[in-house]
Amino acid sequence: HTAAQDNCTCPTNKMTVCSPDGPGGRCQCRALGSGMAVDCSTLTSKCLLLKARMSAPKNARTLVRPSEHALVDNDGLYDPDCDPEGRFKARQCNQTSVCWCVNSVGVRRTDKGDLSLRCDELVRTHHILIDLRHRPTAGAFNHSDLDAELRRLFRERYRLHPKFVAAVHYEQPTIQIELRQNTSQKAAGDVDIGDAAYYFERDIKGESLFQGRGGLDLRVRGEPLQVERTLIYYLDEIPPKFSMKRLT
């Protein structure tokens, strides 16, 4: 697994322990919490990152209206169960035997139940809407410049194939980034949109997962983009199953 050979670190995941004990003395990095080997040439899965985090001390309107089935991650942090590939297991349970089903980005998509709860498959999140509100600037951003800068960011920093950035919408001061990736579209080696969105979220919150700097400060044609708030909506290939009680 590619890691910085000289000082044996993982450029794409600071929440790792690395040592030159791979084949031929190569640098190998393992995720904190799970101890799973990670590929440092790409993004680490969100499931392994959450596990590591828990183990660490401490006009016509161009904006998209999230669908009624869109999920927001209101449950926050938990210590997830990951499969051997580092993906979320469909069923997650806590220490008190409360269980629930999650989607491929680890967001709860059913009511909570007990150990008898069945989650037949891991439902894929195929559409992610990242909703940002920026602080006042010297003037509105040029839409095409903003579009180009955000596409460049997802391509270069998060290694996400450009075809998965479906659209960038802008209606000052709201920016929306749409990521779309169906099961059939995702080839081996492609970064998952859920992982890219998670890295982006952590960057915006000043908690970069990359080695080095603490956060991400965006500029569009030199203009500082200071984010005021971020909301992320997740849409699954199969709508979530919540009781009417929760919906009211």
Epitope: R135, D217, R221, G222, E223, Q226
Partner: antibody
Framework: QVQLVQSGAEVKKPGASVKVSCKAS????????IHWVRQAPGQRLEWMGY????????KYNEKFKGRVTITRDTSASTAYMELSSLRSEDTAVYYC????????????WGQGTLVTVSS | DIQMTQSPSSLSASVGDRVTITCKAS??????LAWYQQKPGKAPKLLIS???SLETGVPSRFSGSGSGKDYTLTISSLQPEDFATYYC????????FGQGTKVEIK
């Protein structure tokens, strides 16, 4: 190497205006905004505003709005800060600064221009 | 506006001492914090940005930590050239500075 060179010290009377220049070199002038920050004697640093040389857009600290005007001459790679209706409290060292290449912190600073307001 | 409160406003220390300066923001600034060193008659010099990232050429005795509203600058072993005034600055919502901490020779 990146350099910001400011104009010399000024002495002004209350009510007058002052215009300070900041010449940038060692990088593409239109790539970064230019901030203006001032420091009155014994006081903290105070952000006044910035100009984006790429499109002439400006953003000001509310405290100085109406009194400060930041402009630029792209052909001369120079930014200017003009402060009007001067009062004695405006006696300070005025700095121009350029952001860090990766963050919005201020990495490169001019040497400072002392503006004294006195009758 | 976000207010930045630095403490102490001044401190006396000897060469070799460990020095800690704290900075508290009036709201969460999500690690958008920089530390500057300023010597008399000179412009500020950027030491740390992103709360923890040391700038190129800055000695490793300087370190930054913290998150949310609370941040710290530590000088592990004070050197003669470190006697100066230190400022914190937030850049999460426009730009504001702390009032400064003057580090003097004991």
């Amino acid at each position: 190497q990146v350099q910001l060179v400011q104009s010399g010290a000024e002495v002004k009377k209350p009510g007058a205006s002052v215009k300070v220049s900041c010449k940038a070199s060692g990088y593409t002038f239109t790539t970064y905004v230019i901030h203006w920050v001032r420091q009155a004697p014994g006081q903290r640093l105070e952000w006044m505003g910035y100009i984006n040389p790429n499109n002439d857009g400006t953003k000001y600290n509310e405290k100085f709005k109406g009194r400060v005007t930041i402009t630029r001459d792209t052909s001369a790679s120079t930014a200017y800060m003009e402060l009007s209706s001067l009062r004695s409290e405006d006696t300070a060292v005025y700095y121009c600064a350029r952001p860090h290449f990766e963050t919005h912190a201020m990495d490169y600073w001019g040497q400072g221009t002392l503006v004294t307001v006195s009758s | 506006d976000i207010q930045m409160t630095q403490s102490p406003s001044s401190l006396s220390a000897s060469v070799g001492d460990r020095v800690t300066i704290t900075c508290k923001a009036s709201e969460d600034i999500f690690n958008r914090l920089a530390w500057y060193q300023q010597k008399p008659g000179k412009a500020p010099k950027l030491l740390i940005s992103g709360a923890t990232s040391l700038e190129t050429g800055v000695p490793s005795r300087f370190s930054g930590s913290g998150s949310g509203k609370d941040y710290t600058l530590t000088i592990s072993s004070l050197q003669p050239e470190d006697f100066a005034t230190y400022y914190c600055q937030q850049y999460w919502n426009t730009w504001t500075f702390g009032q400064g901490t003057k580090v003097e020779i004991k």
